[in-house]
Structure formats: C-alpha cells, structure tokens
C-alpha cells in the first residue's frame, strides 16, 4: 500500500508531471524544428552560395566571353556545362576557329587571353570533329611546337607528345627551321599536320575546357 | 558537407526519432490497455472512466494514420 | 523530381510525423497519469499496480533521451 496523499498534493504532482511531459514535447518539437530548419535553410544557403559562386565564375569569364551557351549535364539540375557562345563543343572541351592571321606566338597569346590554348589534339575523333569546321584552302595553327629545332615536339598545355597519336602529312615534319605545326588540307591525303615557320601569320584553333557551373 | 548529404543525415535523424517515438507510443498504449483490463477485472468496472478515455485515444490514433 | 527535392519532401513528412507523434505521446502520457490519480482516489489504491507500472514507463522515458 502506498501511503495516502492529499488531493492537493496529487493535483500539484499531476501539474508537475504535465509540465514535464509538455516541456519534453516542446523540446522534442524544437529539436525537430531545428533539424527541419537546418535541412531547409542550409541547403537554401548552400544553393545561394552556389549561385553566388556561379555568378562570380560567370563574371570571371564575362571579361572575354559576354555570353555562354550551357547544356545540362546528366540528370542533376545542378550541373551545367558551358561554352562561350560562338564556340563549338565536343566532349569536355570548347573550340574556337580564329580567322585572324597571326604568328604562332601571337595566336597562342590570343587564345590564352580567352582562357584557352591553341588546340591540343588527343584523338582521331577529336581531329575529325575539328576539321568539320575548317576551310580547305586555309591553314590553322595547332598548339604544337618545337622551339629548340631538335624535333622535341611539345604541346602548349604540357600534354606529353605521343608519336602514335599524330596526324602528320607524309614526309612531315621536314625542316628544322619550321618549328610550329599547322593543320591543313592536301588533296592527296585530306587533312593532316605540317611544320611551318612560327612567325608566318596563319589562322588558328583555340581549345578550352568546358566551363562547369 | 554537401547539400544532399546534409539532407540525408537529417532524414536519418527524423526517421530514427519517428521510430523511437512510435515504439514508445505503442508500448505506452499497450500498457494502458493492459491496465484498463486489469482494472476492469479487479473492480467490476470501477474504472470504466479510464477504459472509455483510453478508447477515445485509440479512436484518435486509428483515424490519424501515420504517413506511409 | 530530382533526388534532392525528394529528400526535402521526405524531410517534411518525417518532421510532421514527428510533431504529431510527440503530441499524441504526451497527450497519452498525461491521460495515463490522470487516470492513475483518478483510480487512486476512487478505490483507495486498488490500482496501485497501474500507478507503479506508469511510473516505470516514466522512468524509461526519462532515461531514453530523444536523439539530438
């Protein structure tokens, strides 16, 4: 048997119990709310900071690319890959055919001002894509040179030069004084590479990584 | 932490909270039911009030289905 | 719907479920306590057993802190 309690005490006990239980409920709900708020607000802030980052990234590129053409990568709405508007895209890169005639060094500088390099061709598929946009009666500088004239060809972006993935015209390269490479069309062999003097003005092809925002 | 990761972590927390509370609620509900039956047997319905009130609570839960 | 959007919807559902269940649990807890008191008054402690059992449940809940 429990000793008898006064009704007043019992009422007081019940009141305290109710207070404890509802306090616990309030605390639990507050914790839930905090969780839920964090789950809603943090992603919102995350999205906001992501948007801010994107805008600053875009502003960074806007200096030389006033407009970008973007496509959604995969299913996620978050990931967009962009190329500057007049540029063409292939795989993870953007390409620009410069029709101004400039020396090799000036062409490379011109590309780098746009955040790119003279084109580095890594595969036959890439070359096949590029030549679709070229004129047969023109020559275009590639990002390939041999400044020492010792036949140590090097790509502008430091990609290792792989003899097995080259598309020289037959008999090329053929002159130690011709230290820069172009891509041009020869009726006998179609499109291929040739070595020429670096100071001679030619058209050029710029290549840059796609801009991911 | 990335944005989706955070969401999944909070999902897990809310899910666990839901499970724990559901278990506690069911346990308490069963205790109340048992108590009501015991009370009825012992005092021939002295505690009909409790039984009724318990029944009301049961009705409420029946109508308020937890989300699937 | 994208994967993250789905996660937020699930968050909302679990959140609401958590709140509803918290309220129901607290309501039931208080009902049980009130019933115990009423029972005590009516039968001079015939239902001490119920009271004790309720107390145990209270102890359990006290120790089992809800996840932070």
């Amino acid at each position: 048997m429990v000793p008898e309690e006064e009704p007043q005490d019992r009422e007081k006990g019940l009141w305290w119990f109710q207070l404890k239980v509802w306090s616990m409920a309030v605390v639990s709900i507050l914790l839930l709310s905090v969780c839920f708020t964090v789950s809603s607000v943090v992603p919102h802030n995350f999205m906001y900071s992501k948007t801010v980052k994107r805008l600053s990234k875009l502003r960074e590129y806007q200096q030389y690319h006033p407009s970008l053409t973007c496509v959604m990568e995969g299913k996620d709405i978050e990931d967009w890959s962009c190329c500057p508007t007049p540029w063409t895209s292939f795989q993870s890169s953007c390409y620009f055919i410069s029709t101004g005639m400039q020396s090799w060094t000036k062409s490379q500088k011109n590309c780098s001002v746009m955040g790119a390099d003279l084109v580095v061709i890594n595969t036959r598929e890439e070359q096949d894509f590029i030549i679709q946009n070229l004129k047969r009666n023109s020559s275009y500088f590639l990002g390939l040179s041999d400044p020492g004239g010792r036949r140590h060809w090097q790509w502008v972006d430091q990609t290792p030069y792989n003899e097995n993935v080259t598309f020289w015209h037959s008999g090329e390269p053929n002159n130690l004084d011709e230290r820069c490479a172009i891509i041009n069309f020869r009726s006998s062999e179609e499109w291929g590479w040739n070595d020429i003097h670096c100071h001679v003005p030619q058209k050029s092809i710029c290549k840059m990584k796609k801009i991911y925002i | 932490l990335g944005e989706p990761q955070l969401c999944y972590i909070l999902d897990a927390i809310l899910f666990l909270y839901g499970i724990v509370l559901t278990l506690l609620y069911c346990r308490l509900k069963i205790q109340v039911r048992k108590a009501a039956i015991t009370s009825y047997e012992k005092s021939d319905g002295v505690y009909t009030g409790l039984s009724t009130r318990n029944q009301e609570t049961y009705e409420t839960l029946k109508h308020e289905k937890p989300p699937q | 719907l994208g994967e993250p959007q789905l996660c937020y919807i699930l968050d909302a559902i679990l959140f609401l479920y958590g709140i509803v269940l918290t309220l129901l649990y607290c309501r039931l807890k208080i009902q049980v306590r009130k019933a115990a008191i009423t029972s005590y008054e009516k039968s001079d402690g015939v239902y001490t057993g119920l009271s004790t059992r309720n107390q145990e449940t209270y102890e359990t809940l006290k120790h089992e802190k809800p996840p932070q």
């Epitope: 060094t105 490379q108 500088k109 400044p147 020492g148 053929n174 004084d177 230290r179 003005p201 | - | -």
Partner: antibody, heavy 121, light 111 residues
C-alpha cells in the same frame, strides 16, 4: 669562312625592273633560310623578302608584295631578288643576310657587303 | 607591325664608362621564357654585325663587355667598359612575327 657577295645594283628609272644576286660560300647554302634587307639613305634597316631553306615559303612586307620576287638556286649557292615597278622609295643599299632560327623567331647572323640601288628619274 | 623605338638616338660616352641603349617594342616580343629581341652593331661602311640574340645571348666572337637584358617590351644593350672600337650605330630587331622589324638605331660616340 662565311661569305656573301651581292651584285646587280644600279641606277634605274621609276617603273623599271632589276635583278639582284647574292653569291654565298663557306656554308651549306641549301640548309639556311635567306633574306634581303635594305638600308635606306637615312640609315634605317628594312626587311624586304625571305625564302625558306626548303624553297617552300617566300614572305614579303606589304610595301613590296607583288613587285619583288625572291628566289634561290641551291645548285649555284645563289640568292636572287627580282624587282619590278620600282619606285623612288626603293632607293637603298640592299644586303643579303643568312637567317638563324632561334626558338619561335630568327635573327641574321651574317650579312653581305651590300649593293646599291638608286631609283631616280 | 611591331614598332621598335630606340633611345637615345645618339649618345657620347667616355672611354671605360658604361653605355646603355634602350629598345622598346610596341607589343611583347617574349613568349614564355623566350625573349625574341636581337642586337646588331654597324660601323661606317660595313654591314650590320650580330652582337646578341634572344635578348641576352652573346654571339660567338663578340667581346664580353657587351651584354643584353630585358623581356616583354623593354630591352637594354649595355657596353662596359666602352672602348674606342665600339663607336658605331646599334640596332635592335625582332622577328617574333612578320614582318621582322628594326629599331631606328642609336649612334654611339666615344669621348
């Protein structure tokens, strides 16, 4: 010893034509790009034409393009400059120079003694 | 075309002193580590003679008192100590792109 001797300079009238020659010796002529550079009466140096070692390319500044033609005869170790539609501003001392490529550019490491062209009515 | 501006147009330097000739290009004549400016000396009645190529490389047979420096658009030819036989005109030249161009020349006199 590297030697280059220019010849063919003369006094001509505006509109006339003239051919300059440069006989090279003391080096493997066919292996080098060659240029013509002129020095005007006010002592300014001005590039006139270039021919590549393989005879595959010829380059000219706009001021002479279409009027001057550079050529070479590797068998005779001789460089030529055919000039037509001559103007008074073509009056200068004409040097032939051997080109040496350095990185992406070139310089002239040997020069001939020069031959004088005067265009005057 | 790239315009090369030499300064001063003429200078007189005492024997044994330092002569400094400057050449400024209208645009960069450097590419990465390559500085494509060259210097020539021309004595009266003679053709130009190569002194320095690639901004700072001394041509073989040229005395070590000649030195060159610079990058991008600003280049300098130094002669120290100046000797009697250094009285001549000095020209800078670039050929990073066509047409290759020359500076207007600097006439050095020995006092």
């Amino acid at each position: 010893e590297v030697q280059m001797v220019e010849s063919g300079g003369d006094l001509v009238k505006p509109g006339d034509s003239l051919k300059l020659s440069c006989a090279a010796s003391g080096f493997t002529f066919r292996s080098y790009g060659m240029s013509w550079v002129r020095q005007t009466p006010d002592k300014r140096l001005e590039w006139v034409a270039t021919i590549s070692s393989g005879d595959s390319y010829t380059y000219y500044p706009d001021s002479v393009k279409g009027r001057f033609t550079i050529s070479r005869d590797n068998a005779k170790n001789t460089l030529y400059l055919q000039m037509s539609s001559l103007k008074s501003e073509d009056t200068a001392l004409y040097y032939c120079a051997r080109q040496i490529y350095y990185d992406y550019a070139y310089y002239f490491d040997f020069w001939g003694q020069g031959t004088t062209l005067t265009v005057s009515s | 075309d790239i315009v090369l501006t030499q300064s001063p147009a003429s200078l007189a330097v005492s024997l044994g002193q330092r002569a400094t000739i400057s050449c400024r290009a209208s645009e960069s004549v450097s590419f990465r580590t390559s500085h494509l400016m060259h210097w020539y000396q021309q004595k009266p009645g003679q053709p130009p003679k190569l002194l320095i190529y690639g901004a700072s490389n001394l041509e073989s047979g040229v005395p070590a008192r000649f030195s060159g420096s610079g990058s991008e658009t600003d280049f300098t030819l130094n002669i120290h100590p100046v000797e009697e036989e250094d009285a001549a005109a000095y020209f800078c030249q670039q050929s990073i792109e066509d047409p290759p161009t020359f500076g207007g020349g600097t006439k050095l006199e020995i006092k």
